[in-house]
């Protein structure tokens, strides 16, 4: 099996985490995708998910989290805006493939948020003066409840939607975007686990 790996990102309060989960395969394009936090000794908790079927280039906002699925490039963009210290933790992207186990996209993200702001002298993050506006056209999606008998280390999500009413617009200044790429699980593992095209086809959104 593919070894679970982490990438660590250290940010200041108020900054934005901007990650790209690379799901690569067309079969996954319209599958529902989720952003989860993994706390020690607990099952993964879904913080936000795309619609089902996942819509192309259609932002979904849950509180300070914005998901945007780009089918044509096989990328799920996840933004966590206005980061708080309590956002620190281990995160992952997954693809829902009910009734089968979700596929986890590697690598996991170890987010460390510290006090201060991006303009703090000595910070290794470059501050920017951009104002980030999250359009009011974003929607919320209901995330499925999904439990699994697997061990936590294999990251099966037990999804409970953490839904809060999003602001119609969020303005952020002095934001540093940390851009990263996520890798798909190994091709060998995927070939064994990949759900059939027939099963996927009813999820396809035209």
């Amino acid at each position: 099996a593919t070894k679970l790996t982490e990438e660590k990102y250290e940010l200041k309060e108020g900054q934005t985490l901007d990650v790209k989960c690379d799901y690569t395969l067309e079969a996954f394009a319209s599958s529902q995708k989720a952003w989860q936090i993994i706390r020690d000794g607990e099952m993964p908790k879904t913080l936000a998910c795309t619609e089902r079927p996942s819509k192309n280039s259609h932002p979904v906002q849950v509180g300070r989290i914005i998901l945007e699925d780009y089918h044509d490039h096989g990328l799920l963009r996840v933004r966590m805006v206005n980061l708080q210290v309590e956002d620190s933790g281990l995160y992952q992207c997954v693809i829902y493939q009910p009734p089968k186990e979700p596929h986890m996209l590697f690598d996991r993200i170890r987010l460390v948020v510290t006090k201060g702001f991006s303009g703090t002298p000595g910070s290794n993050e470059n501050s920017t003066q951009n104002v980030y506006k999250i359009p009011p056209t974003t929607t919320k999606a209901l995330c499925p409840l999904y439990t699994s008998p697997r061990t936590v280390t294999q990251a099966p999500p037990k999804s409970t939607a953490d839904v809060s009413t999003p602001d119609s617009e969020i303005n952020l200044t002095n934001v540093t975007d940390i851009i990263r790429e996520q890798k798909l699980i190994s091709e060998e593992d995927l070939e064994q686990k990949l759900i059939s095209e027939e099963d996927l086809h009813h999820h396809h959104h035209h």
Partner: antibody, heavy 121, light 111 residues
């Protein structure tokens, strides 16, 4: 081991037709888009077109130079991709390669050895 | 269509020296700072071989003397210490937009 084997090349007269095949093995064929790339003797590489998977309704895309004359298709049950070439021109003379990408808009990691198509009277 | 222009068209470098090939795109080949630009090596009578994908990622099995850099419209393939077996034609290719396109190629020879 991933293998791509092209066949069907040969000599054809201008205005004629030819159908190339690409037999794939060593991977789940239905999961990946398949592409055709050609190369005239002593010249550079030219992307011909691609066909996506069933999940994308087998959508096809072509280079302007072949659009309307060439058609890419696939038979997932036979693990084979095809390039139907009609109204052939002398400038279509080239080695035609079948390639497989690594996913949506990803790199061409696997190539066949190519098959030569000669359009001449 | 996105046009990729490689420079130089041909290049002669001494063994052990650094070789640099540039590829300029007529428009950005990035999506979210994710460059859909790849490099291939082709030797006579053989199909192309993938060297670098997404601008800077070394393909498995490719010697680490090969490296790629750049983003947006300007990209570079570098061979840090030229070996005899590196004599070939090198192509850049973009997959950010249809139609996919290749650069015209750069012929690398030993000086």
């Amino acid at each position: 081991e991933v293998q791509l084997v092209e066949s069907g090349g040969g000599l054809v007269q201008p205005g004629g037709s030819l159908k190339l095949s690409c037999a794939a093995s060593g991977f789940t064929f239905s999961t990946y888009a398949m592409h055709w790339v050609r190369q005239a003797s002593g010249k550079g590489l030219e992307w011909v077109g691609r066909i996506r998977t069933k999940s994308s309704n087998y959508a096809t895309y072509y280079a302007a130079s072949v659009k309307g004359r060439f058609t890419i298709s696939r038979d997932d049950s036979k693990n084979t991709a095809y390039l139907q070439m009609n109204s052939l021109k002398t400038e279509d003379t080239a080695v035609y390669y079948c390639t497989r990408d690594m996913g949506i808009r990803r790199q061409f990691a696997y190539w066949g050895q190519g098959t030569l198509v000669t359009v001449s009277s | 269509d996105i046009v990729l222009t490689q420079s130089p068209d041909s290049l002669a470098v001494s063994l052990g020296e650094r070789a640099t090939i540039n590829c300029r795109a007529s428009e950005s080949v990035d999506t979210f700072d994710y460059s859909f630009l790849h490099w291939y090596q082709q030797k006579p009578g053989q199909p192309p071989k993938l060297l670098i994908y997404r601008a800077s990622n070394l393909e498995s099995g490719v010697p680490d003397r090969f490296s790629g850099s750049g983003s947006g419209t300007d990209f570079t393939l570098t061979i840090s210490s030229l070996q005899a077996e590196d004599v070939a034609v090198y192509y850049c290719q973009q997959s950010n937009e249809d139609p996919y396109t290749f650069g015209q190629g750069t012929k690398l020879e030993i000086k």
